[in-house]
């Protein structure tokens, strides 16, 4: 009896894993063994598929070959017992098209109200990935354990924290890889759960602000409680995408080292041209907080964030606020070509109860004044990137008289 | 394969000085921080402190501070411990170790057993 | 400094049993905390580090567990090379510090 030539035959690729699958033709026939030929794009002559030779179930593994990836191949499949079938040719391919990336390794830290997630690629050293390593981006699904309620975190680098979580609670999360230059999307790695400690004694500072005052950097955080001593690093941010770093060495800001107020200055020099993170930690001399979230700060964006400088036209029962770009000296404008959003504090001139107006306009109403009383006002520009949380000085503040009654109009 | 080999036992005279030794291998050393502890003979293991060798960037226990210095020298992947004032108490083993972040103590080196006595 | 204390301080045990060995931090120190184990005359050897990942090469009848100030160490069966002293060591603040060390021993 002619044998017959296996059918459907898929072709897998997992990073540096090559496996092939394929339907026997004839289930009645027993003993039946399957081989491979291979052929490279340009040559006449069909070469063995080492790992790929008299295999006796539907599947086998060609990773030992050393192929270049970027090549397109063909290969060729026949049944044999005492006879051989015809060849059947699978259509030929390129090892990086059809390959997709594998499940990436995870290692989970926790502390009380955050998780780190280090990120590395599954295969060490992958040839498919060699010259693509240092692009790949991640994304992952976080969740609850209790609830399921997913939130999802797309384009984060190889170590990521995720903040505001709850003490003493697990949190599953699942991540995979990618690679937006070729759009390739990964496999999802395992479910990974980790449980949040017991709720630190010393919360980490918040609100960290970096402002420029003459020729030195002003560094601001908020704290709860008070006799404590904080330390502040500083990393540049490019690390955190170089995906074989494990280990971030984040550097000590000398002159805000032991600091026991919650506020430090440095100097401008200190800091060279570049995007850094900072975060900073408390401690009361027995007990460290966890550090603080980190802030990205770019020495171009505020060097140059200045206060924004505005005029007031006065009403009965409002202030009309026009914002115009800050003066630099000599009194010529700066132009930023990135988006601000401004932060308007105002109060009555006799009163030191402010009140706030957030705006991403240029011209903004200060409603509900009272009539021929003098408020104050001052202003300061944000940058509107989260992550990047710039914000200049205030600008001085400018203080005027509201009209009489009727003149809202 | 990541080795990290430390220099032969010495023995010192009170009040003298001694550097150990502990050349990297299998690795860059500039990508990681070197540890160093002490172990007294029967006794448990005691953190001395630890350098950046990329830039010199050091941290001691204030135990150690003054009396311990840590130095590296890149060009042959070693770093170094020095040890001022030796006491009779200070006959002990020195290991350094290999921190990788999370991944913490990950290599030590087969130690270094210093002698002091007069 | 944070201060870590591990019981027991000696364990007298036999070949299969499970074993658990605990330490406490002084202060929280989320999951920075790795476990050594040493025996006489050589260099400590890493089983476990960030409280629950094995070092590759560790067998997996060692586990680590925990978060905050209190972790253990299991041997799930102790072997015979399994005789030696424990360590668990925290890194998340410095001075980094050790526990005092379990010592195990044959029954």
């Known amino acids: 009896k002619n044998l017959k030539s296996p059918q459907k035959v898929e072709v897998d690729i997992i990073d540096d894993n090559f496996i092939l699958r394929w339907n026997r033709s004839d289930e009645s026939v027993g003993n039946v063994t399957f081989s491979f030929d291979y052929q490279k794009t340009g040559m006449d002559n069909w070469i063995k598929l080492s790992g790929c030779q008299n295999i006796t179930s539907t599947k086998c593994n060609f990773s030992s070959l050393k192929l270049n990836v970027y090549e397109e191949i063909k290969l060729r499949i026949r049944a044999e017992k005492e006879n051989t079938s015809s060849w059947y040719e699978v259509d030929s391919f390129t090892p990086f098209r059809k390959a997709q990336i594998g499940p990436p390794e995870v290692h989970l830290e926790a502390e009380d109200k955050a998780i780190v997630i280090h990120i590395s690629p599954g295969t060490k050293d992958s040839v498919m990935w060699a010259l693509d390593g240092l692009s790949f981006t991640y994304s992952l699904v976080i969740w609850k354990n209790s609830s399921g309620v997913e939130e999802r975190i797309e384009n984060i680098y190889s170590r990521h924290k995720i903040y505001k979580l709850s003490p003493e609670t697990t949190y599953c999360l699942k991540v995979k890889a990618a690679l937006l230059t070729s759009w390739k999307i990964g496999v999802y790695s395992p479910v990974h759960c980790i449980k949040t400690t017991v709720e630190n004694e010393l919360p980490p500072p918040e609100n960290i602000e970096v402002s420029v005052q003459n020729q030195n950097y002003v560094l601001k955080w908020d704290y709860t409680y008070a006799n404590m001593t904080f330390q502040v690093q500083w990393l540049h941010a490019f690390l955190k995408r170089n995906p074989g770093n494990h280990l971030y060495k984040w550097k000590q800001i000398p002159d805000c080292e032991n600091v026991k107020t919650t506020q430090c200055v440095f100097p401008q020099n200190v800091f060279q041209k570049g995007i850094y993170l900072l975060r900073v930690q408390a401690s009361d001399g027995n007990n460290t907080s966890f550090w603080s979230e980190e802030i990205k700060f770019d020495t171009e964006i505020q060097a140059f964030l200045l206060p924004p400088v505005f005029n007031i036209r006065s009403l009965s029962d409002s202030f009309h606020i026009y914002i115009g770009a800050p003066k630099q000296s000599g009194n010529t404008p700066v132009i930023q070509d990135y988006p601000l959003i401004y932060e308007i504090i105002f109060w009555e001139n006799t009163s030191n109860a402010e009140r706030k107006i957030i705006e991403k306009k240029t011209d903004v109403t200060v409603p509900n004044l009272k009539p021929l009383t003098v408020y104050c006002v001052k202003a300061r520009a944000h940058t509107m990137d989260e992550k990047l949380n710039k914000s200049s000085v205030f600008s001085d503040a400018v203080c005027e008289k509201t009209k009489p009654g009727n003149t809202s109009k | 394969q990541v080795q990290l080999v430390q220099s032969g036992a010495e023995v010192k005279k009170p009040g003298a000085s001694v550097k150990l030794s502990c050349k990297g291998s299998?690795?860059?050393?500039?990508?990681?921080?070197i540890h160093w502890v002490k172990q007294a003979p029967g006794q448990g293991l005691e953190w001395i402190g630890r350098?950046?060798?990329?830039?010199?960037?050091?941290k001691y226990a204030p135990k150690f501070q003054g009396r311990a210095t840590i130095t590296a020298d890149t060009s042959i992947s070693t770093a170094y411990l020095e040890l001022s004032r030796l006491r009779s108490d200070d006959t002990v083993v020195y290991y350094c170790?290999?921190?990788?972040?999370?991944?913490?103590?990950?290599?030590w080196g087969q130690g270094t057993l210093v002698t002091v006595s007069s | 400094d944070i201060q870590m204390t591990q019981s027991p301080s000696s364990l007298s045990t036999s070949v299969g049993d499970r074993v658990t060995i605990t330490c406490k931090t002084s202060?929280?120190?989320?999951?920075?905390v790795a476990w050594y184990q040493q025996k006489p005359g050589k260099a400590p050897k890493p089983l476990i580090y960030?409280?629950?990942y094995r070092y590759s090469g560790v067998p997996s009848r060692f586990s680590g567990s925990g978060s905050g100030t209190d972790f253990t160490l299991t041997i799930s069966s102790v072997q015979p090379e399994d005789f030696a002293t424990y360590y668990c060591?925290?890194?998340?603040?410095?001075?980094?510090?050790f526990g005092p060390g379990t010592k195990l021993d044959i029954k």
């Open positions: 060591h925290q890194y998340f603040s410095y001075p980094y510090t």
């Open positions: 170790g290999r921190y990788h972040g999370y991944w913490a103590l990950d290599y």
């Open positions: 299998g690795f860059n050393i500039k990508d990681y921080y």
């Open positions: 350098i950046d060798p990329e830039d010199a960037e050091t």
């Open positions: 202060q929280n120190v989320g999951t920075n």
């Open positions: 960030s409280t629950s």
